[in-house]
Amino acid sequence: EAHKSEIAHRYNDLGEQHFKGLVLIAFSQYLQKCSYDEHAKLVQEVTDFAKTCVADESAANCDKSLHTLFGDKLCAIPNLRENYGELADCCTKQEPERNECFLQHKDDNPSLPPFERPEAEAMCTSFKENPTTFMGHYLHEVARRHPYFYAPELLYYAEQYNEILTQCCAEADKESCLTPKLDGVKEKALVSSVRQRMKCSSMQKFGERAFKAWAVARLSQTFPNADFAEITKLATDLTKVNKECCHGDLLECADDRAELAKYMCENQATISSKLQTCCDKPLLKKAHCLSEVEHDTMPADLPAIAADFVEDQEVCKNYAEAKDVFLGTFLYEYSRRHPDYSVSLLLRLAKKYEATLEKCCAEANPPACYGTVLAEFQPLVEEPKNLVKTNCDLYEKLGEYGFQNAILVRYTQKAPQVSTPTLVEAARNLGRVGTKCCTLPEDQRLPCVEDYLSAILNRVCLLHEKTPVSEHVTKCCSGSLVERRPCFSALTVDETYVPKEFKAETFTFHSDICTLPEKEKQIKKQTALAELVKHKPKATAEQLKTVMDDFAQFLDTCCKAADKDTCFSTEGPNLVTRCKDALA
């Protein structure tokens, strides 16, 4: 239904708190360099304006679109060109081009310092002084670093943050209460960020149809008792919600997500038997819970997939009559039978099925041609299964840090031209798949591993797009989203790469490394490892292990020494010489 004032409508639907949070996220994701105070001022102005429109929808400018209102606010910021360069050119455009322009200038890797958590006492003091400002800072800092973070989900994480602080700041030992809980939220939020970025990439690069296919597969796995019409309705609604969030329409997105959650809870009988617990929760928790609800029990009497899609003489007729519906039905039927497959794999199978029909339905005897299609799925299924087994075995043998190092070596060999910080970040993230997925029951491993890896590799592609340096990476990133992970897995050592010359300073360390937190120490060591591989791309695992063990021993010795500086300056050059010899 059309509303006289869009801003008044959204303010009424969302309520002041969520409205302000979402506007803050929107501004922080568009203008990532502005301070919290600058954005907070704009948010207050927008909120005050929204209230005037609630009081009188016919008031001046209340009929303007949200893009117009928000864009005008952003374009009125002083020193826009000095701070944002060519982004200021967006302000010369009219809507909808202006918003598109803002979207194109979102930076997936902004040059902002890592978000440092203050120590417990300081955090509790500022939280108690002004919880609203404290949470505003959290939203601002996360949103500007993650310009595609799913806005309603970020409100959920802020709520989690709030609850943890409320609980832990009342404890005697605030630190030991806060640290593990906030680490947990941070880890979940980071995974949420890369997953959502993948969805926006799918939408941006391949359009709504591609995202809807992803949604059909995912929803069919989770709700195998829902019929195809129900799954299609949910997928259509979910596509709309994600399109809005990816497009910067955060108020509409959050509002429609709340509507979708309401619909699901009102229609549990036709969707799933597992929704009640989620539906008893308040809005943000409810929507979050529904997004990761456990799979419903599969119906016991599902016929074999072959009956309708292989053995039926009418396959080509049904395909010709409504290609998308027929393929959608296939994806639905296959996915509801396979909660143990990744969405990426299900989409590859649907693509294979479509290609088979395209080829076979053009033949004189189609049934004879497409009759073997299910057998042709086998290698597509075996490949990711083998990947999971190999990698989980390696993870169990090496632990997370060792597994990250193995991946780092592998990926540096595949794409040695990529910058070391990007390789280290990617390897650390890819390596976390072990901890995240390999401990799960067998039937949950494959979907967890492959869909997580796909999201991480999407980030690798986004970073590489900014400064393309590797033909290997370009090749894998320019293909379809579901083929990326198999493409990266299949890459071998880049034979075109000219090894980097050995620079002693790259492997020279100082005593300050001793006081770094464990994570930072690991990153330093992994940086050195990537540089070693760039120097000797064909070094054996044994050679690299020797060097890294020597390196770890050197750090351990010097960090325990009475005179650390002397130890580093005398033993360091010896280590460098030994490294060169070991790799010769």
Epitope: Q313, E314, A320, E321, A362
Partner: nanobody, 115 residues
Framework: KVQLVESGGGLVQPGNSLRLSCAAS????????MSWVRQAPGKGLEWVSS????????LYADSAKGRFTISRDNAKTTLYLQMNSLRAEDTAVYYC????????SSQGTLVTVSS
């Protein structure tokens, strides 16, 4: 919406010829193999002939071999069946179908072979 409209049927004496046409719309005609099937009075559906999307490959039931020729014009999105040396047992309603389908969704065209 997929539409198939057959024409060209009629009453013909044994030994004579007929050419059936099927005008297709609502789908990418050249991407699909097409078939002719028939249903004689009081009998079940019987496959007659099929042709690939490009027109390069054709298949025939034993009862049609040597007498019938299937062809297509992708520019006109039309399927044809040239029937020579017609016999009384060729009397049936003839339908064109997509792919290997044996369940017609069209009206068909009646061919009656009688002296």
């Amino acid at each position: 919406k997929v539409q198939l409209v057959e024409s060209g049927g009629g009453l013909v004496q044994p030994g004579n010829s007929l050419r059936l046409s099927c005008a297709a719309s609502g789908f990418t005609f050249s991407s699909f193999g097409m078939s002719w099937v028939r249903q004689a009075p009081g009998k079940g559906l019987e496959w007659v002939s099929s042709i690939s999307g490009s027109g390069s490959d054709a298949l025939y039931a034993d009862s049609a071999k040597g007498r019938f020729t299937i062809s297509r014009d992708n520019a006109k999105t039309t399927l044809y069946l040239q029937m020579n040396s017609l016999r009384a047992e060729d009397t049936a309603v003839y339908y064109c179908t997509i792919g290997g389908s044996l369940s017609p969704s069209s009206q068909g065209t009646l061919v009656t072979v009688s002296s």
